[in-house]
């Protein structure tokens, strides 16, 4: 057993022309959330049920309102990881689908309060227990940056989380750095060590001493991008010379792009330009259908009558939206201000306010500077309901009560000695240097190398 973890780093317009308009507007603010679906294996014809390895839904991100005239920025993201627990062995190879959904605030009951902004897919090799793998995927004009990893939940260990390790009450007979494993008390498991030099970003191992490459990388240590290793023989006698006499199989040979996608080589691998309605590394993922399980909260999925409406979700009572993801409850009108949490107590609503705010609706920004002095000549600065002190020279800390050590940051260059002084710091420069921070060398003829005015 273990957990697949996905961390979204950014979602925003991709590079190049045709930047998308912000999905939110001043008239219709919105927020994002993400859904990840995992399937085992790398097979194009995977016959598994949708999300056979599991699926997860993120929290809602902060509310975003487009600034008129401004280009769409990276949009504010939900906090935390998406976690997909798996009960059985981690398969090592898996397919993923990551969907970016938009929640339109203030939409109508039963209306399309939810819409799919972007959908990316890919197939990867990944050993459990390995480091975070970083990825960038594009869907239309959008770009999603994320990291992922699989980790075993104790007592499971190993690259597939299939071996059970248990701590022993008796002193271990295993040597340093080794740990006893069940079911054999005498068996000692070494932490998995890949071949020396195996790329931590692009390689992994399932057995000690091996180095297996992630998609798009090759070479004994997985340090060579696929597209640069396609020479069967070098152009000339020197192996340092680049280019190929006989072109080897390129990454686009045989067109890996499905569903009419066109392939183009990239410095690291290849890229498929997909026709409308298809996504994924190889254009293998079509627009959302019932097979993808798009209806949440027990909604019944019915195939749509036309390609633009591939499915319709019939929602159970209490749920709304085109994907039954929105419980339209009495907190939906957002009575709590300044990030307060709305609680429905049954007879009424109550707001739990963030620090620095008060009032029934968290409408009052507490003046934390009132009655709170900053020591040693510091001045109080308000902002966001919190107070902070801007401290006078030589003091620090929340209330300027701590004496700051001006020498802590080692401000004197070129070996100069730093001395704390009541007005700040003084640098005693090493021979050959001068300046308040010993930053300027003194030339032998006596002229200093001061910057030109």
């Amino acid at each position: 057993a273990g957990v697949f973890e996905l961390q979204i780093h950014s979602f925003g317009p991709g590079p190049g022309p045709g930047a998308p308009r912000s999905p939110c507007s001043a008239r219709l603010p919105c927020r994002l959330f993400f859904r990840v679906c995992l399937k085992p294996g790398l097979s194009e014809e995977a016959a598994e049920s949708p999300c056979a390895l599991g699926a997860a839904l993120s929290a809602r991100g902060p509310v975003y309102t487009e600034q008129p005239g401004a280009p769409a920025p990276d949009l504010p993201l939900p906090d935390g990881l998406l976690q997909v627990p798996f009960r059985d062995a981690w398969p090592g190879t898996f397919s993923f689908i990551i969907e970016t959904w938009r929640e339109e605030l203030g939409d109508q009951i039963g209306g399309p309060a939810w819409s799919l902004l972007a959908r990316v897919a890919g197939r990867r090799r990944l050993a459990a227990g390995g480091p975070w793998a970083r990825d960038i995927q594009r869907a239309g004009a959008w770009e999603l940056r994320f990291s992922y990893r699989a980790r075993c939940e104790p007592p499971a260990v190993g690259t597939a989380c299939t071996r059970l390790c248990r701590p022993r009450s008796a002193p271990s007979r295993c040597g340093p750095g080794l740990r006893p494993c069940a079911p054999l008390e005498d068996e000692c498991e070494a932490p998995l060590v890949c071949r020396a030099g195996c790329s931590p970003e692009h390689g992994f191992c399932e057995q000690p001493g091996e180095c297996r490459c992630l998609e798009g990388w090759t070479g004994p240590l997985c340090t060579v991008p696929v597209s640069t290793s396609s020479c069967l023989s070098p152009r000339g006698p020197s192996s340092a010379t680049t280019g190929c006499l006989v072109p080897g199989p390129g990454p686009c040979d045989g067109n890996p792009c499905a569903n009419g996608g066109s392939c183009s080589e990239t410095p690291r691998s290849f890229e498929c330009t997909c026709p409308r309605g298809f996504y994924g590394l190889r254009c293998e993922v079509s627009g959302v259908t019932c097979a993808d399980g798009p209806c949440f909260n027990g909604g019944l999925c019915v195939g749509g009558a036309d390609p633009d409406s591939a499915y319709i979700c019939h929602c159970p009572p209490g749920f709304q939206g085109s994907n039954c993801e929105k419980r339209v409850d009495r907190c939906s009108l957002q009575p709590c201000r300044n990030g307060g949490l709305c609680l429905d107590l049954g007879h009424a609503l109550r707001c739990r306010c963030r620090a620095g705010f008060a009032g029934p609706r968290c409408e009052h920004d507490l003046d934390d500077c009132a009655g709170r002095a900053c020591a040693n000549g510091g001045t109080c600065v308000e902002g966001g309901g919190a107070h902070r002190c801007s401290c006078a020279l030589g003091f620090g800390g929340r209330d300027c009560r701590e004496r700051a050590d001006p020498c802590a940051a080692r401000p004197c260059a070129h070996g100069g000695r730093c001395y704390a002084h009541f007005s700040g710091l003084v640098c005693a420069c090493a021979p050959g240097y001068m300046g308040a921070r010993c930053e300027f060398p003194v030339h032998p003829d006596g002229a200093s190398a001061l910057p030109a005015a």
């Epitope: 203030g106 109508q108 009495r330 009108l333 957002q334 009575p335 049954g346 007879h347 609503l349 609706r361």
Partner: antibody, heavy 120, light 107 residues
């Protein structure tokens, strides 16, 4: 004194649009939601939707989807109901009614109503 | 949507009579309901909120009771100005819904 004063009666042709206003006074406008309720001639009351004047967030009854838009102008403490593509069956009295945003109270104060007549 | 079934749809009574109107919700609404009075040609007026609390300025002869899905409005001693239409409304869940109304007429 709490008051909700609505705009006057409207006579419109089918296909036209109308914007009914509800001006609030005597309380903090942004602390109360504004409900809109319709009453067709000789019929009961129908809830159309609700708006939070502070944020502009709205929720609509699915029956009043598409042609009906709720909005507010905080600077003038006024809530609006706009109906487009008017039909004969939109002939009714339209009421605004405030409701405490923490739902401690029901719809305690109502506007006097605006009669909208749709006829060719 | 929550259905609010109000009964009776009309009743005739005399001044001084005790009048009871009931409202049944299609599911429990935890007291999140109110009673409204509407006179001909006028806007509705709030009488009761949270099932049992009197709005400001409402005479004490009006009272509300009930819990779960069943609620009652009682006028202990009917006065001439009480002849009107009465509606229940639930605000437990969106969309809010009204009962069909009860017309209280002079016998």
């Amino acid at each position: 004194e709490v008051q909700l004063v609505q705009s006057g009666s409207e006579l419109k042709k089918p296909g036209a649009s109308v914007k009914v206003s509800c001006k609030a006074s005597g309380y903090t406008f942004t602390d109360y939601y504004m409900n809109w309720v319709r009453q067709a001639p000789g019929q009961g009351l129908e809830w159309m939707g609700i708006i939070n004047p502070y944020s502009g967030v709205t929720i609509y009854n699915h029956k009043f989807k598409g042609r009906f838009v709720l909005s507010v102008d905080k600077s003038s403490n006024t809530a609006y109901l706009q109906i487009s593509s008017l039909k004969a069956e939109d002939t009714a009295v339209y009421y605004c009614a405030r409701q405490d945003s923490l739902l401690d109270y029901a719809m305690d104060y109502w506007g006097q109503g605006t009669t909208v007549t749709v006829s060719s | 949507d929550i259905q609010m079934t109000q009964s009776p749809s009309s009743l005739s009574a005399s001044v001084g009579d005790r009048v009871t109107i009931t409202c049944h919700a299609s599911q429990g609404i935890s007291g999140n309901m109110g009673w409204l009075q509407q006179k001909p040609g006028k806007a509705p007026k709030g009488l009761i909120y949270h099932g049992a609390n009197l709005e400001d300025g409402v005479p004490s002869r009006f009272s509300g009771s009930g819990s779960g899905a069943d609620y009652t409005l009682t006028i202990s001693s009917l006065q001439p100005e009480d002849f009107a239409d009465y509606y229940c409304v639930q605000y437990a869940q969106f969309p809010y819904t009204f009962g069909g109304g009860t017309k209280v007429e002079i016998k």
